[in-house]
């Protein structure tokens, strides 16, 4: 029996800069039961908190609800392991909840085939941004990814779209069917999951005009 | 015709800043990016950053955050860079130039080029 | 930041000639690759896009080709306004970012 190993914080992340979770991975458990308490302070201030809600993310996590997230602070956060045989803590992690946005995908996405003048076929995908993010008002601007790949194929075809929710894919197999995804990034922050995947057979003939 | 018309030199102190505009004509201004690149005298190119004008989105080359920003006015379909606490290392040439419709990075129209020569 | 080497720096040749200019990405950019051409006092000019594609108006004897990190412009049957500076540029995502240029001159 020994006291507990040394937690780590494993990431914090928020989908909308409003709330954040913090995760962390336990140390060894030193043989005894243990308990683990994540607290923190906000640069430039004295006073230690506790973390508010351990429930809401789940096991070896803090979630800080709106009431507790504040933008323009630094948080310093620490997770402490406690057992009968004494204590440790983690390194302390200082977060900027500007830069740990973690959005949602992007919603409603559309595959449409389409054709030029010149009869040369093409895909049009196009999104929404995520439900939460205020796109027009500047409080999140979005950068976007897609990728694509025939249905049996191992590997994805990416292309950064930059701030367009709009792409056009030429020089696709006819007879083929595509599976689409497509993810986001705010200016600051991380890439969002990729989307659920939605799929499209490019046709064999096509006598459709734009 | 695609057309992007930068405004004229300019002869600044050390320590000042410059905002450069770039009036777009012959399409329409808020579907396509509008870029700036720097090229400094017999140099090659550097990527400053992007704006899109369709809803104010912009990237930057991480060099240029803290000395360039980036805005549009799309009433009157111009761009603009304003580039602060200026030193001897600013003195260049700046394009503005038009993304690709579609692809995000190539830059199918240039500006004729804004020189700005920092000096005391 | 993806870097893109250009080679050579400089090239000599002379009208009605072919020639082959070469860039190489630090990591796969697929196709997503451009040449620009840039004479004296202008600013550049897009000649190909997505590593082949010619832009609008550009002579067919200008070519591009590559994927992954290697690309090359082949410009065949050299004319007199060819003569310049030629840059290669990554349009994968940000940062984009240029090669160090190749200037072409007469020979």
């Known amino acids: 029996q020994s006291p507990p190993g040394k937690p780590e914080i494993h990431k914090c992340r928020s989908p909308d800069k409003e709330t954040f979770t913090c995760w962390w991975n336990p140390g060894t458990d030193g043989g005894l039961p243990t308990n683990y308490s994540l607290t923190y302070s906000k640069e430039g201030e004295k006073t230690t908190y506790e973390c508010p809600d351990y429930k809401t993310s789940g096991p070896n996590s803090c979630f800080f609800s709106k009431q507790y997230t504040s933008i323009w602070k630094i948080y310093i956060i620490t997770v402490n392991a406690t057992n009968q045989m004494g204590s440790s803590s983690s390194d302390p992690l200082y977060v900027d909840v500007t830069y740990i946005v973690e959005p949602e995908p992007p919603r409603n996405l559309t595959l449409e085939v389409k054709q030029l003048k010149d009869k040369k076929t093409y895909l049009w995908v196009k999104w929404s941004p995520p439900t939460i993010t205020d796109v027009k008002t500047g409080w999140f601007t979005m950068e976007y990814e897609i990728r694509l790949k025939p249905e049996e194929a191992e590997e994805w075809e990416i292309h950064f779209t930059g701030h367009q929710t709009q792409f056009k894919v030429f020089d696709l197999y006819p007879g083929q069917k595509y599976l689409v995804q497509t993810r986001c990034k705010p200016d600051h922050g991380y890439w969002s999951r990729w989307s659920q995947e939605s799929s499209v057979e490019m046709p064999n003939d096509f006598t459709l005009k734009d | 015709e695609v057309q992007l018309q930068q405004s004229g030199p300019e002869l600044v102190k050390p320590g000042a800043s410059v905002k450069i505009s770039c009036k777009a004509s012959g399409y329409t201004f808020t579907d396509y990016n509008i870029h700036w690149v720097k090229q400094s005298h017999g140099k090659s190119l550097e990527w400053i950053g992007y704006i899109y004008p369709n809803n104010d989105g912009t990237g930057y080359n991480q060099k240029f955050k803290s000395k360039a920003t980036l805005t549009v006015d799309n009433s009157s379909s111009t761009a603009y860079m304003e580039v602060r606490s200026l030193t001897s290392e600013d003195s260049a040439v700046y394009y503005c130039?038009?993304?690709?419709?579609?692809?995000?990075?190539?830059?199918?129209?240039w500006g004729q080029g804004t020189s700005v020569t920092v000096s005391s | 930041d993806i870097q893109m080497t250009q080679s050579p720096a400089s090239l000599s040749a002379s009208v009605g000639e072919t020639v082959t200019i070469t860039c190489r990405a630090s990591e796969n950019i697929y196709s997503y690759l451009a040449w620009y051409q840039q004479k004296q006092g202008k600013p550049p000019q897009l000649l190909v896009y997505n590593a082949k594609t010619l832009a609008e108006g550009v002579p067919s004897r200008f070519s591009g080709g590559g994927s992954g990190t290697q690309f090359s412009l082949k410009i065949n049957s050299l004319q007199p306004e060819d003569f310049g500076s030629y840059y290669c540029q990554h349009h994968y995502a940000t940062p984009f970012t240029f090669g160090s240029g190749t200037k072409l001159e007469i020979k």
């Open positions: 130039a038009r993304g690709d419709g579609n692809y995000v990075g190539d830059m199918d129209y």
